[in-house]
Interface confidence: low
Amino acid sequence: MRTEAQVPALQPPEPGLEGAMGHRTLVLPWVLLTLCVTAGTPEVWVQVRMEATELSSFTIRCGFLGSGSISLVTVSWGGPNGAGGTTLAVLHPERGIRQWAPARQARWETQSSISLILEGSGASSPCANTTFCCKFASFPEGSWEACGSLPPSSDPGLSAPPTPAPILRADLAGILGVSGVLLFGCVYLLHLLRRHKHRPAPRLQPSRTSPQAPRARAWAPSQASQAALHVPYATINTSCRPATLDTAHPHGGPSWWASLPTHAAHRPQGPAAWASTPIPARGSFVSVENGLYAQAGERPPHTGPGLTLFPDPRGPRAMEGPLGVR
């Protein structure tokens, strides 16, 4: 049996305005609202479960519901990546998978979802109230992140219902292109809606859903418009902090990396794009979309932005054996 905590992300509002508005003032807001609703805000869902048979074993599943191409997935714990979280795994559709202890196996489950098995004992072992976050970088939507954790009182022997707790961040830089106009429209819509102070503002009501189609619906257009402009971003405080991570794959042979176009997944390229890249110093690598940098055996510190990924010369799954362990 498993204990699960599933975290759906926010969804654009459904038109649910009550009361009457003058016809003149209604037309433009509805047009803009339609634009906001159909803008296709992507979603990220996170599901965390603890195996009853192995109390120190966690399975994290994350999925991306969007129309774009995924260019990178980063899984972290202890909080969102770049906000105190520690990277557990990085999955790139072309360059492959990297993982760090206590991650045991990271893998693609489908074209738009991944799973990560964690297990450990002692300092690096996850505990029940640890927060796990998944960040999907995609084209053209940008980066979207959601986090989830098991309820502190979870009993691994009992199956707990999924508990929605939306935690989402959008790196707006990646989505400001065409969306800029829509965002401006949403701002104007928000302005119009706020003028009607007689209208009560219902609260966000996340709905419990399955992992296949996680969805938290925002019933208040005004609040949802705010969410579209400045997506709520929260971190669950945890008393269980992961220890410094060592690389999970200290095997011989050079690790080398190549520069990666920000939107590589939109135009997939074969290894020819990086096969001839000069090999840097043995054992060193720099990783991923949030600019992680690491030396072999060291925990990757956080650095500035920049999308650089560094594949193992032996291929995308060289770091991932039959059980994801080397």
Epitope: S69, T110, Q111, A265, P271, G315, P316, E320, P322
Partner: antibody
């Protein structure tokens, strides 16, 4: 059960165009990538490339760039292989194959269509 | 491109025998190697994925091993339905390549 059903045999002349279909059933079409594999008479298997059924982005092996095109009809769970300006050396059996798991360097082709035999002859 | 060499090209066996088919890669491919069986006028069927992982519905007499550049498919106690072509395929890098195949035939 999971099935990939391909269109029937084709007889074409050089210079013509052919479009082979592959209809998937028994699973969510957009969950798994779709590869295309060529097998010339009495020969081995050659990977032509694949299409991401989620994003619709195709990727072609070097030998199959130019005259070959992968496409989708997602609503009907169909994948298509179109070959333009047919040549005699295109005579082969073409297979569609579902990919598992997904990553652009995809790997395991766990379900295959029955194959479509294309004969190009003047 | 990564070249996969299968040997022997043809293997003649008697039902009940156990056989090993070899696949050698021209460069390191970790465990990114898969085995397929293809009978005459049929489509290939996945037997083993990632060098040694079994596939649901495939008889347990099929097993795989190896890593890096040398791989083996073993068929314990061959049955008549096992005769046909066997291909290995790598997914370590583009383009995916298949071995030339080993024909398993009745002696």
């Amino acid at each position: 059960q999971i099935q990939l059903v391909q269109s029937g045999p084709e007889l074409k002349k050089p210079g013509e165009t052919v479009k082979i279909s592959c209809k998937a059933s028994g699973y969510t079409f957009t969950t798994y990538g779709m590869s295309w594999v060529k097998q010339a008479p009495g020969k081995g298997l050659k990977w032509m490339g694949w299409i991401n059924t989620y994003s619709g982005v195709p990727t072609y092996a070097d030998d199959f760039k130019g005259r070959f095109a992968f496409s989708l009809e997602t609503s009907a769970s169909n994948a298509y292989l179109q070959i333009n300006n047919l040549k005699n050396e295109d005579t082969a059996t073409y297979f569609c194959a579902r990919e598992l798991p997904f990553t652009t360097i995809i790997g395991t082709k766990d379900y295959w269509g029955q194959g479509t035999t294309l004969t190009v002859s003047s | 491109d990564i070249v996969l060499i299968q040997s022997p090209a043809t293997l003649s066996v008697t039902p009940g025998d156990s056989v090993s088919l070899s696949c050698r890669a021209s460069q390191f491919i970790s465990n990114n190697l898969h085995w397929y069986q293809q009978k005459s006028h049929e489509s290939p069927r996945l037997l083993i994925k990632y060098a040694s992982q079994s596939i649901s519905g495939i008889p347990s007499r099929f097993s795989g091993g190896g890593s890096g550049t040398d791989f083996t498919l073993t068929v314990n106690s061959v049955e008549t339905e096992d005769f046909g072509m066997y291909f290995c395929q790598q997914s370590n890098s583009w383009p995916h390549t298949f071995g030339g195949g080993t024909k398993l035939e009745i002696k």
